[in-house]
């Protein structure tokens, strides 16, 4: 049988002869050359010789254990005279020993890692890993051991797991942002003679809101004209804040001063300034100066960082509103004015006022838009507004007169104003009810006495307070001995009755009444209008059939039949 | 004055791509982010992008429907703005404009007269 | 995202009539990112109001803007021919949205 145990064989032997490994050796070998041992498998012929005759083995080259660790052969010793295997084949195993020749490597030659600025010591910030390519179950060649050879006292790391944290309190992002750490990783435990191998980790503090804002200056003044429109950007101011991104946006707030409902605060998107803005309109003449508190506060507050005071600033703002040459500004937005139409020439209406509100106070001179009183039916004093009438008025023709006055400052004729002035002309009883229409009737010659033949209807273009009342009656001159009557209704209408039974066409053909129409106003005003009765034929229903002036194509009368 | 001039629109076969440019001036460039806004034929307003300034490492925004194929990018030496468009699909017909916000870069204050791009096999 | 709701999508009216269009947003909003354009046909858009209620410069005083919170409007107190334009609402938190316009017509 086979006599060997299992081969050992040093890595990385730098002798100058060959390397011996060992002996194949069989019991049957009497040691006088008769059986000759030959080896097969990993390297047999290059890497490893045997000696044929004595079974020695050796290594030709010198072996890496990172490269290959095992090495498996085949072993047959055989009798040289019969050439047949004295023993069975066999395997066997060349294991290569090591030795600690791989210092440690970083998984990465430069790591990147970030913790918060003001982190609390041990806060864990990266774990770095270094691997060893050495035998890990044989001696202490692959035992890595964790070092920091750059980097306090701000770092550790731990010696077993790689594993970097803070080691200094309030590390502050706004006074150091970025810090450099090397890592040392070294074999065989971290002893002497061990191999080490470092790698570098940038480590940057991110930010916390640990700033609050502050103005750099306590007061700010800023000028505006009071022309400006709301909206109106007036000025900026700007809180730092040390902080960055979302910890240094900034919101601005006006807390306190008069301008609180006058003046508004925004904050620039992107430059976080505070933009001062007009929110209503400003007058000069009723206040020059205005004064705020802005305040410019984190709206992203940290709690744990409270205890550092508020995370606010306040600074005044001190606002100045610049005088602007206004136009005269009326009294009324509009002039209601009223004035009876019988006034005579040169009547005063009324009046208007306007100021120049500049502090100034420049004079003002009127005038009428003669665009909108083309007829110069009016007139004002160009030195106290008083409105007069320059011809006769008739309300009859126009009810109402809508016209302009403009007002102009004596020292600057650009700035002028313009107001409406509405006129109202007041009725006067200046003119006759007259008849609504022209009558012509009929009368037939069978009628009765007491029939109503015509109604009459008046008219008046005048306007009484409490409505027309017209009264009806014939001229004096017809009053007596008349066919006919008239019959006052009292409801501004009348009736023409016939007085007698019966009329001859052949005696008279036409009547001609004079109806007097009154009013009941002040002064009584009247007219006398004429009605026209023809005498005609009509049937037995009253129809007319014939009258003697045929000409009469449209009567009026009501029916007189029966 | 504030003016704004886009050019670099075109027709462009899907899947294509093309460079928007727009030239501004009269305003400082560098304080306001700037925008793109298109606007379909016939169709309403929609805003495509939106680059900030460098006080905010010219952080950039996107439409749903053009992320990963626009980039919106900026020069301030130049006072320039482009919109590199690429993988075009046929939606993307549109007048494109470059916009300007008002003052505190709130709204969408001053807009260019527009450059059409359309997108069509 | 925010999306803001317009309405009435298209409407006519007659020169000094009072015309309001209204803008909801789907959650709350600062009434400083809220704005209003006008669109004539052709034209870019031109900003009309700003934060809400304030004028845009050259813009006559016959418009206003009011709202806070989800709901806001533009009003123009008494309609004129040159007013016939489309109408957005837009809001400035990213994404920034628009609404989907309202077309004032002449009737």
């Known amino acids: 049988s086979w006599m060997w145990n299992q081969f050992f064989l040093l890595e990385e032997y730098t002798g100058s002869d060959y390397q011996y490994v060992g002996k194949l050796h069989s019991d049957q070998d009497r040691g006088d050359g008769s059986l000759k041992y030959i080896l097969s498998g990993d390297g047999a012929g290059d890497l490893f010789i045997i000696n044929e005759n004595t079974g020695d083995i050796q290594a030709t080259k010198r072996l890496d254990r990172e490269e290959k660790p095992v090495y498996i052969l085949r072993a047959q010793a055989i009798n040289r005279r019969t050439g047949r295997p004295v023993e069975p084949e066999s395997e066997f195993i060349i294991k290569i020993h090591d030795i600690n020749d791989n210092e440690p490597i970083f998984t990465k030659e430069v790591y990147t890692a970030t913790v918060p600025e003001m982190s609390d010591v041990g806060t864990f910030v990266v774990q770095v890993t270094a691997t060893d390519a050495d035998d890990p179950t044989y001696g202490n060649s692959a035992k890595v051991v964790y070092s920091i050879l750059q980097g306090q006292p701000y770092f550790s790391v731990e010696s077993e797991t790689g594993i970097i944290k803070t080691a200094l309190l309030n590390m502050d992002r706004e006074n150091r942002e970025q810090y450099q750490v090397v890592i040392q990783a070294k074999d065989m435990g971290g002893q002497m003679g061990g191999l080490s191998g470092t790698t570098t980790v940038n480590i940057t503090l991110t930010d916390v809101n640990d700033n609050p804002p502050r103005f750099p200056q306590s007061t700010y003044q800023f000028k505006t004209p009071e022309s400006s429109p709301p909206g109106t950007p007036i000025g900026r101011i700007k809180a730092s804040d040390a902080d960055v991104g979302e910890n240094a946006e900034i919101e601005y707030s006006i807390t306190d001063g008069e301008g609180l409902d006058m003046f508004d605060v925004i904050t620039d998107q992107e430059t976080q300034e505070g933009i001062i803005t007009v929110k209503k309109l400003l007058d000069f003449e009723k206040k020059k100066v205005y004064t705020l508190k802005v305040e410019a506060s984190n709206p992203h507050v940290e709690p744990r960082f409270l205890y550092l005071g508020p995370f606010k600033d306040s600074a005044t703002v001190r606002i100045v509103v610049e005088d602007v040459d206004e136009p005269p500004v009326f009294s009324k937005l509009a002039y209601i004015l009223q004035i009876r139409e019988d006034a005579q020439i040169n009547t005063t209406i009324g009046s208007v006022t306007a100021q120049d509100p500049d502090a100034a106070r420049n004079p003002v001179k009127y005038s009428v838009d003669r665009h909108t009183d083309m007829d110069r039916i009016f007139n004002i004093d160009s030195g106290n507004g008083s409105i007069f009438t320059s011809k006769l008025l008739d309300r009859e023709t126009l009810l109402w007169h809508n016209i302009t006055v403009i007002a102009t400052e004596i020292n600057n004729p650009k700035q002028s104003s313009r107001v409406p002035l509405y006129i109202k002309v007041l009725d006067v009883n200046d003119n006759a009810p007259e008849f609504a229409e022209f009558y012509e009737t009929f009368v037939c010659e069978k009628a009765k006495a007491d029939q109503l033949i015509q109604t009459l209807r008046a008219v008046d273009k005048d306007d009484p307070y409490s409505g027309h009342q017209f009264s009806f009656s014939l001229a004096p001159e017809a009053a007596s001995g008349s066919n006919f009557t008239i019959q006052d209704n009292k409801d501004n209408t009348a009736g023409i009755l016939t007085r007698k039974n019966g009329y001859n066409r052949h005696e008279m053909s036409t009547y001609l009444l004079p109806v007097v129409i009154s009013d009941n106003d002040y002064p009584v005003q009247s007219s006398t209008g004429t009605v026209t009765v023809r005498v005609c034929a009509c049937d037995h229903h009253g129809n007319m059939q014939s009258c003697h002036a045929e000409a009469l194509i449209h009567p009026t009368g009501l029916s007189t039949g029966a | 004055e504030v003016h704004l001039v886009e050019s670099g629109g075109g027709l462009v076969q899907p899947k294509g791509s093309l460079k928007l440019s727009c030239v501004a001036s009269?305003?400082?460039?560098?304080?306001?982010?700037m925008n793109w806004v298109r606007q379909a034929p016939g169709k309403g307003l929609e805003w495509v992008a939106r680059?900030?300034?460098?006080?905010?490492?010219?952080?950039?925004y996107y439409a749903d429907s053009v992320t990963d194929r626009f980039t919106i990018s900026r020069d301030d030496s130049q006072s320039m703005l482009y919109l590199q468009m690429n993988n075009l699909k046929t939606e993307d017909t549109a007048m494109y404009y470059c916009?300007?916000?008002?003052?505190?870069?709130?709204?969408?204050?001053?807009w260019g007269q527009g450059t059409l791009v359309t997108v069509s096999a | 995202e925010i999306v803001l709701t317009q309405s009435p999508t298209t409407m006519a009216a007659s020169p000094g009539e009072k015309i309001t269009i209204t803008c909801s947003a789907s959650?709350?909003?600062?009434?400083?990112?809220l704005h209003w354009y006008q669109q004539k046909p052709g034209f870019s858009p031109k900003l009309l109001i700003y934060?809400?209620?304030y004028l845009a410069s050259g813009v006559p005083l016959r418009f206003t803007g009011s709202g806070s919170g989800t709901s806001y409007s533009l009003t123009i107190g008494t309609m004129e021919a040159e007013d016939v334009a489309t109408y957005y609402c837009?809001?400035?938190?990213?994404?920034?949205?628009f609404g989907a316009g309202t077309k004032l017509e002449l009737k």
């Open positions: 916009v300007r916000p008002d003052y505190g870069n709130y709204g969408l204050a001053y």
């Open positions: 009269g305003f400082t460039f560098t304080t306001y982010a």
């Open positions: 680059i900030r300034i460098k006080n905010n490492n010219y952080a950039t």
């Open positions: 959650s709350s909003i600062s009434s400083h990112y």
């Open positions: 934060r809400s209620f």
């Open positions: 837009q809001q400035d938190i990213v994404p920034l949205t």
